[in-house]
Interface confidence: low
């Protein structure tokens, strides 16, 4: 028999051993041109010595076969001998060692068996209903197709799934999603309605990332406020990598998570934009204002859980950057000013409500006045810190207000509002002796000392009735005692004590009346 | 053309069972996946459960932990045990093959049987 043709003799071997768990196997074979074919399959076991013989029997009844070597792959034409219109059932023979093995048969029509290809470009992934939606263009002129998805974990070996029968110009494919760990699949397609044709390549990888994106565990730290106003915000811990399959490691699209920085600048709530998104990797410079960070993961399926985390606002207060001047129109505030054109947000919070929401109010952009300073005014029907309260007055600066990450800390203070002077007299003043010639003289803390950096000094005032003579006595704003000395004995004294704020002169407490008693000896 | 008769529906107090059968007119060895659909009145036809000739099951969350389908190839049938029953799984109950584009079906759907939850 010529070689490129089927020889309808027997075969030089003895009948085949079909029950090995060796041999000829998966089988397939189809058209790759208008007259030509070509058969291929696998041998599982030593191949030293082994010969292959592919044998086919016709409709009629009538066998022959093609003996092929060691190799496992065949070409024919359609003048070989093997009628290519009408069903023809093929097998493997194997021989080696006096021993034949036999691979299962396939019956087909060898000229409508066309090689299928995998699916090719694009495949959508979607969800539905919990599992895994794969769709794709079916391949030009294959149309009606049988599919096999395979589908591996990092930690898992591939496992095999049906798809089902396609009939369409598209083609999909549901499958298992996991909840937790990121997938590889790979698609196959072949004829469909007949069992024996051969299945296409495997498709190139689909990266399939975990349905729940991966908890960000990221750390931040905020550096000190600079002179600037600003601080940044650094990441310590970066998110960690999700873990991929063997065949999506590298550039593989699809299972990526992307990492995003919400920041939410809970201060100065009257501004235009409270929230921004932006990439991890662009770590911002933040003002001294407080905020809520949220690091939001996402994949191909959208948002996943988010870590938030709270950053207070810098305390550090400078007592001495603001001027205050009240006047009978109203109040202005005088800071330092920065940039042409900056607008400022001046916030202010009685002491002690830190949890309900600051009142605030943002200026028109404004350039510096003759003496560099920035200014923002009030009437006194405005109400604003008209209460004679601690308030805590921070300004943020920005020549760029709708940008969130481009404000900075101008000062953060305390101011007490309403009439300080009187608010501020220091009550329960009392006199106790202390020696011959000395008393001690204690009050009721101001309320100005509930501000902190306000009360600059406490002023003791001591008249002696007799002489008129007036002494004054500067105590320390954190001290509410004093001890009057050289005293005279039989004199009649008054004391009166007030309350001193950088800016402001206090009144005077309710005059006290004191002498100490002549000491008349036995 | 493969016939489907389900049966085994009924009325059952709340959190009762029943367990429903599907008998398909020939072999559904090969059919990949298998469903089971309900439609209350008024109402959409929902998806519910589905098995694929391997034994994978899937379920829609309404009635994940409750519902349990499988699948006898030798004996052409598919089933789906329903425990836990609520009201609202008042409906008619129909299997069919399942598709990627649910409610695309290849067969024609079969008459249901109807599963009524009330004390």
């Known amino acids: 028999c010529r070689t490129s043709e089927c020889c309808f003799q027997d075969p030089p071997y003895s009948d085949a051993d079909s029950g090995s768990a060796s041999g000829p196997r998966d089988l397939s074979c189809y058209r790759i041109s208008s007259a030509g074919y070509e058969c291929s399959w696998q041998y599982e076991g030593p191949t030293a010595g082994v010969s292959h013989f592919l044998r086919c029997c016709l409709s009629s009844g009538r066998c022959c076969y093609f003996a092929t070597g060691s190799a496992t792959r065949l070409q024919f034409s359609d003048q070989a001998g093997v009628s290519v219109l009408h069903t023809v059932t093929l097998w493997v023979e194997s021989w080696a060692r006096n021993r034949t093995e036999k691979s299962p048969e396939v019956t087909l029509q060898l000229y409508k068996s066309v090689k299928y290809k995998p699916p090719l470009g694009d495949i959508k992934v979607s969800k539905l209903a919990g599992q895994l939606r794969m769709e794709w263009e079916t391949p030009d002129n294959q149309v009606g197709a049988e599919v096999q998805f395979r589908h591996r974990t990092p930690s898992s070996s591939w496992k095999l799934g049906d798809c089902g029968p396609q009939d369409d110009d598209t083609e999909s494919c549901l499958c298992p999603l996991e909840m937790n760990v990121a997938q590889e699949f790979q698609l196959r397609r072949r004829r469909l309605g007949s069992q024996g044709s051969s299945w296409s390549k495997w498709s190139s990888p689909v990266c399939v990332p975990p349905e729940n994106p991966p908890q960000p565990q990221v750390r931040f730290s905020v550096e000190q406020l600079g002179r600037d106003g600003r601080r940044r915000l650094t990441l310590k811990e970066q998110p960690t990598q999700l873990e991929l399959p063997e065949g999506c490691q590298g550039p593989a699209p699809g299972v990526e998570v992307t990492y995003q920085l919400q920041l939410h600048m809970l201060s100065c709530p009257c501004k235009a934009k409270a929230t921004r998104t932006l990439p991890l990797e662009k770590m911002p410079y933040l003002s001294g204002a407080a905020y809520n960070v949220a690091v939001i993961s996402s994949n191909r399926f959208g948002p996943g859980p988010n870590q938030t985390w709270h950053i207070p606002a810098d305390t550090h207060t400078e007592p001495v950057a603001l001027n205050i001047s009240v006047g009978t129109n109203g109040t202005t505030m005088y800071w330092p000013a920065r940039a042409q054109s900056t607008t400022y947000c001046i916030e202010w919070q009685p002491v002690g409500q830190e949890g309900s929401l600051a009142t605030c109010n943002l200026t028109a952009p404004q350039d510096p006045d003759p003496a560099g300073m920035a200014t923002y005014s009030w009437s006194r029907e405005s109400g604003a810190m008209g209460q004679e309260k601690c308030y805590h007055i921070t300004i943020f600066a920005s020549a760029h207000p709708k940008k969130l990450t481009l404000w900075s800390t101008v000062l953060s203070t305390y101011h007490f509002g309403g009439n300080a002077s009187a608010a501020g007299t220091p009550h329960h003043v009392s006199v106790k002796n202390h020696s011959l010639d000395s008393v001690s003289v204690d009050w009721a803390p101001s309320l100005l000392s509930t501000c902190p950096g306000v009360l600059k000094e406490y002023v003791v005032r001591c008249r002696d009735e007799d002489s008129n003579q007036v002494s004054e006595h500067p105590v320390q704003p954190t001290e509410t005692q004093v001890t009057l000395s050289d005293l005279r004995a039989g004199v009649a004294y008054t004391v009166q004590v007030r309350a001193d704020t950088a800016w402001l002169r206090g009144a005077w407490s309710q005059p006290q009346r004191f002498s100490i008693k002549v000491q008349v000896s036995d | 053309e493969v016939q489907l008769v389900e049966s085994g529906g009924g009325l059952v107090q709340p959190g009762g069972s029943l367990r429903l059968f599907c008998a398909a007119s020939?072999?559904?060895?090969?059919?990949?996946?298998m469903g089971w659909y309900r439609q209350a009145p008024g109402k959409q036809r929902e998806w519910l459960a589905s098995?694929?000739?391997?034994?994978?099951?899937f379920y829609a969350d309404s009635v994940k932990d409750r519902f349990t389908i499988s699948r006898d190839s030798v004996k052409n049938t598919v089933y789906l045990q329903m425990n836990s029953l609520k009201p609202e799984d008042t409906a008619a109950y129909y299997c069919?093959?399942?598709?990627?584009?649910?409610?695309?079906?290849?067969?024609?759907w079969g008459q249901g049987t109807l599963v009524t939850v009330s004390s």
């Open positions: 020939r072999s559904i060895f090969n059919i990949n996946i």
């Open positions: 098995i694929t000739s391997g034994g994978s099951t």
């Open positions: 069919n093959r399942y598709r990627s584009v649910p409610l695309n079906t290849v067969y024609p």
